[in-house]
């Protein structure tokens, strides 16, 4: 018994369907009952290999793994023909991991691994100030997407006034955090942060208002 499809990595976008191929050929001595098992080893490593779908005794069992309930199906109506491939529909971030196809027909046994990556465009980007927006103070301006596959790229722009970023910030213009030192009133204005990866981008805006220190006399 041998699996003819090679090991591979499959990349798909969130919400799409992933086709995980597993085609096998039998040899004349493989006379036992046909068992097909797909397992997942999730990327978060919190769980050991778990069965997600099983074909045994001419029946399909697909309710082993709650996270994939109703989303994993064999693609062939006749698994005995040598096609144990599956589709995973409506892909989610939690589906990232290593999938293993195991085919048994005694005495033959074979298995094959597929690494599935689910790519998610950045969304829910939030721009905010961490610290006090006062003249002479140090604070951080931050840009954080709610979700998005790594690696992420960041780009800050000043949208108001001269549209020139303060020169002391230039080294951090492509970082998610800009450390502002000894703030001056000229830093006030509207800034945008664009966060992007290879499947999409998102943007948030930040209004910076650098004011004189408040009197804290007691």
């Amino acid at each position: 018994l041998s699996i003819t499809t090679p090991e591979e990595m499959i990349e798909k976008a969130k919400g799409e369907t992933a086709y995980l191929p597993c085609k096998f050929t039998l040899s004349p001595e493989d006379q036992g009952p046909l068992d097909i098992e797909w397992l997942i080893s999730p990327a978060d490593n919190q769980k050991v290999d778990q069965v997600i779908i099983l074909y045994s005794g001419d029946k399909i069992y697909d309710d082993y793994y709650p996270d994939l309930k109703g989303r994993v199906h064999f693609t062939s109506n006749d698994l005995k023909s040598g096609d144990a491939s599956i589709n995973v529909t409506n892909l989610q971030l939690s589906d990232i991991g290593t999938y293993q196809c195991k085919v048994k027909k005694a005495p033959g046994v074979a298995n094959k691994k597929i690494h599935l990556v689910v790519l998610v465009k950045p969304s829910g980007a939030r721009c905010y100030v961490d610290g006090s927006e006062e003249i002479g103070s140090d604070f951080k301006i931050k840009c954080e997407p709610k979700e998005g596959s790594l690696p992420l790229q960041y780009e800050w722009q000043k949208l108001s006034d001269s549209q020139k970023m303060p020169t002391s910030w230039l080294a951090e213009m492509t970082s998610s955090v800009i450390s502002v030192k000894n703030a001056s009133s000229e830093y006030s204005g509207t800034y945008s942060c664009t966060v992007r990866n290879r499947v999409g981008s998102d943007q948030c805006l930040l209004r910076l208002n650098v004011v004189p220190p408040s009197n804290k006399a007691g």
Epitope: E11, L119, K121, Q157, R196, R198, V199, S201, L205
Partner: antibody, heavy 117, light 107 residues
Framework: QVQLQQPGAELVKPGASVKLSCKAS????????INWVKQRPGQGLEWIGN????????KYNEKFKSKATLTVDTSSSTAHMQLSSLTSDDSAVYYC??????????WGQGTLVTVSA | DIQMTQSPASLSASVGETVTITCRAS??????LAWYQQKQGKSPQLLVY???LLADGVPSRFSGSGSGTQYSLKINSLQSEDVARYYC?????????FGGGTKLEIK
């Protein structure tokens, strides 16, 4: 469905300016970049620049920085590109395209700009 | 600016054949790559983004692959409606640039 409507053609005189329009519908206009791409007759594609309608932030190809000015009117979901000091080199089809990131998922039909005396 | 070199500039193949178009970037673009199809007199259409992901509604006979600086677009079981010019485009860092295009004809 996403639609980007552009006028079919513009005839302009050398040295003049032209303002091209791109009316978007079928999606949230302020949430996606609008890109502009130039294609000279029988030639390849050149990216001019893009604008994010939600903030009017822009990015330009340095080659077109003194030639093109990108603006948006969010009330009518329309993007504009003004081309100035036109010469015969500017005769081309100009496409607007919606960016799902910085790849172009949906394209307008293009406006043919002809610069001729 | 990152240069995109596409090859071949033109190719002719028969219906049912498999064709491959390649695109080389002048530096690593980390799979920030898209492929477009442009039929005569029409606007370009997105086929593939992120180097490997098929755009909505694109037939599964199209597939993208590659990483680093080398990428390819494969068309399995060529159809007569695939006659077009194909372009790659990187979107790693501005300015985004396109390959010179590949003109695909049917024998």
């Amino acid at each position: 469905q996403v639609q980007l409507q552009q006028p079919g053609a513009e005839l302009v005189k050398p040295g003049a300016s032209v303002k091209l329009s791109c009316k978007a519908s079928g999606y949230t206009f302020t949430s996606y970049w609008i890109n502009w791409v130039k294609q000279r007759p029988g030639q390849g594609l050149e990216w001019i620049g893009n604008i994010y309608p939600g903030s009017s932030s822009t990015k330009y190809n340095e080659k077109f920085k003194s030639k093109a000015t990108l603006t948006v009117d969010t009330s009518s979901s329309t993007a504009h590109m003004q081309l100035s000091s036109l010469t015969s080199d500017d005769s081309a089809v100009y496409y607007c395209a919606k960016g799902d990131g910085d790849y172009f998922a949906d394209w307008g039909q293009g406006t043919l700009v002809t610069v001729s005396a | 600016d990152i240069q995109m070199t596409q090859s071949p500039a033109s190719l002719s193949a028969s219906v049912g054949e498999t064709v491959t178009i390649t695109c080389r970037a002048s530096e690593n673009i980390d799979s920030y790559l898209a492929w477009y199809q442009q039929k005569q007199g029409k606007s370009p259409q997105l086929l593939v983004y992120a180097a490997t992901l098929l755009a909505d509604g694109v037939p599964s006979r199209f597939s993208g692959s590659g990483s680093g600086t080398q990428y390819s677009l494969k068309i399995n079981s060529l159809q007569s409606e695939d006659v077009a010019r194909y372009y790659c485009q990187h979107y790693y860092s501005t300015p985004w640039t396109f390959g010179g295009g590949t003109k695909l004809e049917i024998k």
